[in-house]
Interface confidence: low
C-alpha cells in the first residue's frame, strides 16, 4: 500500500507522458489522477515505466474501479496486463475480440499463464460458447489451446467452430479429447465430397469408431501410417485384413515397420495368419490356421 502524500507543487500530471518516468512511486501516487490515467491508458504502453511504477498505476486503477475495470481500460492495458492477478481478471467482463487479441499480444511468445487462462475463460463464458472467431484467435496465439481443454470443456465447442481447427492444433490432444471432437468434425464436414472430407477429417480420426473406419475403407482414401497409428486400438481391432488394406492403399507396406507397436501389434494378434499372409509383408503373430476364434467382446458382454 502506497502512503498518501500531497503532490509537490508543479508536479500534478496534466497528461500521461514520458516525464512521468522520472517520478518516484509516491509522486506517481500523489500526482497522477486515476481518471486521467483511465482515459489515457493507451499511452502507458509507449512509456518505459519500471515494474514498480506499473504497480502504482495498477493500484490507482484498482482504487478507481474496485468492482473491475471497464473494457475501455482493459483494451489498452498493454504490459500492465502482466501485473494483473487471476483474481483481478475474474472481475472483468470482456466481450470484444479486439480486447482479447490486444491482451494476448502482450503475452505472445510465452506459454499460457494463469492470467491468460482466466482471461480466456472470462471471454468464452461471456460469449456462451467457443465460437469460430474466438477459436481462430486462440489457436493462432496458442496452437495447443484446444488440447489444453478437458473433454468436458470440449463438449461445449459447437461443430461450426471445428472449421477453424488446423491439424497442428490437435497435435497434443489425447484419445479422450479426440473422442469428443471427432463427432463434431463429422457433423461439420458432412456435406463435403469424399476426398475433401477425408483431408478435413483426417486429423480427428483418433476419435473415430470402427464403423466409420470401415466406411472410409470403401472410399479409396489411402490413409497414411502416421494417421493409422493414432487410431483408437478398440476401433482398429475389428477391422478385417481386407478393410485395412483398402484403408491404407499403397501405405499398407508400412505395417511391417510398425508391427511391434499399437494398434498394429494388437490388430495382428486378432487376424488369421493366412489372411495376414495375403498382404505379402511377412507379418507374424496371427491366429494359426485351424484354431477356433472366440469373440471375447461378446463373451464379456454376456458374463
Amino acid at each position: 500500500e502506497v502512503e498518501k502524500t500531497a503532490c509537490p507543487s508543479g508536479k500534478k500530471a496534466r497528461e500521461i507522458d514520458e516525464s512521468l518516468i522520472f517520478y518516484k512511486k509516491w509522486e506517481l501516487e500523489a500526482c497522477v489522477d486515476a481518471a486521467l490515467l483511465a482515459t489515457q491508458m493507451d499511452r502507458v504502453n509507449a512509456i518505459p515505466f519500471t515494474y514498480e511504477q506499473l504497480d502504482v498505476l495498477k493500484h490507482k486503477l484498482d482504487e478507481l474501479y474496485p468492482q473491475g475495470y471497464p473494457e475501455s481500460v482493459i483494451q489498452h492495458l498493454g504490459y500492465l496486463f502482466l501485473k494483473m492477478s487471476p483474481e483481478d481478471i475474474r472481475k472483468w467482463n470482456v466481450t470484444s475480440l479486439e480486447t482479447l487479441k490486444a491482451l494476448l499480444e502482450v503475452n505472445k511468445g510465452h506459454e499460457m499463464s494463469p492470467q491468460v487462462a482466466t482471461l480466456i475463460d472470462r471471454f468464452v463464458k461471456g460469449r456462451g460458447q467457443l465460437d469460430k472467431d474466438t477459436l481462430d484467435t486462440l489457436t493462432a496465439f496458442y496452437p495447443g489451446y484446444l488440447c489444453s481443454l478437458s473433454p468436458e470443456e470440449l463438449s461445449s465447442v459447437p461443430p461450426s467452430s471445428i472449421w477453424a481447427v488446423r491439424p497442428q492444433d490437435l497435435d497434443t490432444c489425447d484419445p479422450r479429447q479426440l473422442d469428443v471432437l471427432y463427432p463434431k468434425a463429422r457433423l461439420a464436414f458432412q456435406n463435403m465430397n469424399g476426398s475433401e472430407y477425408f483431408v478435413k477429417i483426417q486429423s480427428f480420426l483418433g476419435g473415430a469408431p470402427t464403423e466409420d473406419l470401415k466406411a472410409l475403407s470403401q472410399q479409396n482414401v489411402s490413409m497414411d501410417l502416421a494417421t493409422f497409428m493414432k487410431l483408437r486400438t478398440d476401433a482398429v481391432l475389428p477391422l478385417t485384413v481386407a478393410e485395412v488394406q483398402k484403408l491404407l492403399g499403397p501405405h499398407v507396406e508400412g505395417l511391417k515397420a510398425e508391427e511391434r507397436h499399437r494398434p498394429v501389434r494388437d490388430w495382428i494378434l486378432r487376424q488369421r495368419q493366412d489372411d495376414l499372409d495375403t498382404l505379402g509383408l511377412g507379418l507374424q503373430g496371427g491366429i494359426p490356421n485351424g484354431y477356433l476364434v472366440l469373440d471375447l467382446s461378446m463373451q464379456e458382454a454376456l458374463s
Epitope: P114, A117, T118, D121, K125, G128, S148, S150, P151, E152, E153, S156, D174, R176
Partner: antibody, heavy 121, light 107 residues
C-alpha cells in the same frame, strides 16, 4: 456473503425417497454449474453428479452408483438446487454437500455445510 | 473412469515440518487437479486448483505441482491449523473423482 445451505436430510428406509434442497445466495446462481458431493461416515469424498447452467445447456451428469436413481434439477428463479433420491440403499448413507463448479476448471470452490441422509431399516 | 491414488493415507508430523502428499491419476489429466483440506465436521475447502494455482485467501505455505499423472501438495512449514485430511480431485472428465484422502496428524 456467498453461501450455500442444504436442507431435507433425515432418516429414510431402504427403497424410500428423499429430496434435498440447496439454497444459494451471494453469487449469480444461474451462471453456476452446481454439483452434489457426498461423504459416507468416516469415508472419503465422492462426486454424485452435476447440472450445468442453462446457458451451457442445463445438462446433467451422474456417478455410476446413483445413475437412474438420483435426479439433479435447478430452479434459477428461486436460486435453488435439488437432489431427488429414489430407491435409496443403505450405502447411500452420507453427508450430502452442495457445491459450485468453476466452469473452466471444474473445481468446487463454494460448499454448503452439508446435510446428513441416513438410510436404515 | 479415472482413478486417483493418494499416498500416504496418513502421516504424523510436527509443527514446522515440511509435508508432502502425492496423488497419482490412472491416466493423464494434464493440469486438471485440485487439492482440498477438510477438518472434522466441516465442509472441504479448496486450497489449490489447476495443479499449482493457489486459491485466494489460502496461505502461501501451501503449494501444488505436477502435470500429467503425478501431482504433489506441499506444506512448507506445518502450522497447528493444518492438521486435517487432504484430498486430491481430478477435474479432467466426468465422473469427477477424488483421491482416498491423506490424514495429517500431530506427532
Amino acid at each position: 456473503e456467498v453461501q450455500l445451505v442444504e436442507s431435507g436430510g433425515g432418516l429414510v428406509k431402504p427403497g424410500g425417497s428423499l429430496r434435498l434442497s440447496c439454497a444459494a445466495s451471494g453469487f449469480t446462481f444461474s451462471n453456476a454449474w452446481m454439483s452434489w458431493v457426498r461423504q459416507a461416515p468416516g469415508k472419503g469424498l465422492e462426486w454424485v453428479g452435476r447440472i450445468k447452467s442453462k446457458t451451457d445447456g442445463g445438462t446433467t451428469d451422474y456417478a455410476a452408483p446413483v445413475k437412474g436413481r438420483f435426479t439433479i434439477s435447478r430452479d434459477d428463479s428461486k436460486n435453488t438446487l435439488y437432489l431427488q433420491m429414489n430407491s435409496l440403499k443403505t450405502e447411500d448413507t452420507a453427508v450430502y454437500y452442495c457445491t459450485t463448479d468453476l466452469p473452466k476448471l471444474r473445481n468446487f470452490h463454494i460448499w454448503g455445510q452439508g446435510t446428513l441422509v441416513t438410510v436404515s431399516s | 473412469d479415472i482413478q486417483m491414488t493418494q499416498s500416504p493415507s496418513s502421516l504424523s508430523a510436527s509443527v514446522g515440518d515440511r509435508v508432502t502428499i502425492t496423488c497419482r491419476a490412472s491416466q493423464s489429466i494434464s493440469s486438471y487437479l485440485n487439492w482440498y483440506q477438510q477438518k472434522p465436521g466441516k465442509a472441504p475447502k479448496l486450497l489449490i486448483y489447476a495443479a499449482s494455482s493457489l486459491q485466494s485467501g489460502v496461505p502461501s505455505r501451501f503449494s501444488g505441482s505436477g502435470s500429467g499423472t503425478d501431482f504433489t501438495l506441499t506444506i512448507s512449514s506445518l502450522q497447528p491449523e493444518d492438521f486435517a485430511t487432504y484430498y486430491c480431485q481430478q477435474s479432467y472428465s466426468t465422473p469427477l473423482t477424488f483421491g482416498g484422502g491423506t490424514k495429517v496428524e500431530i506427532k
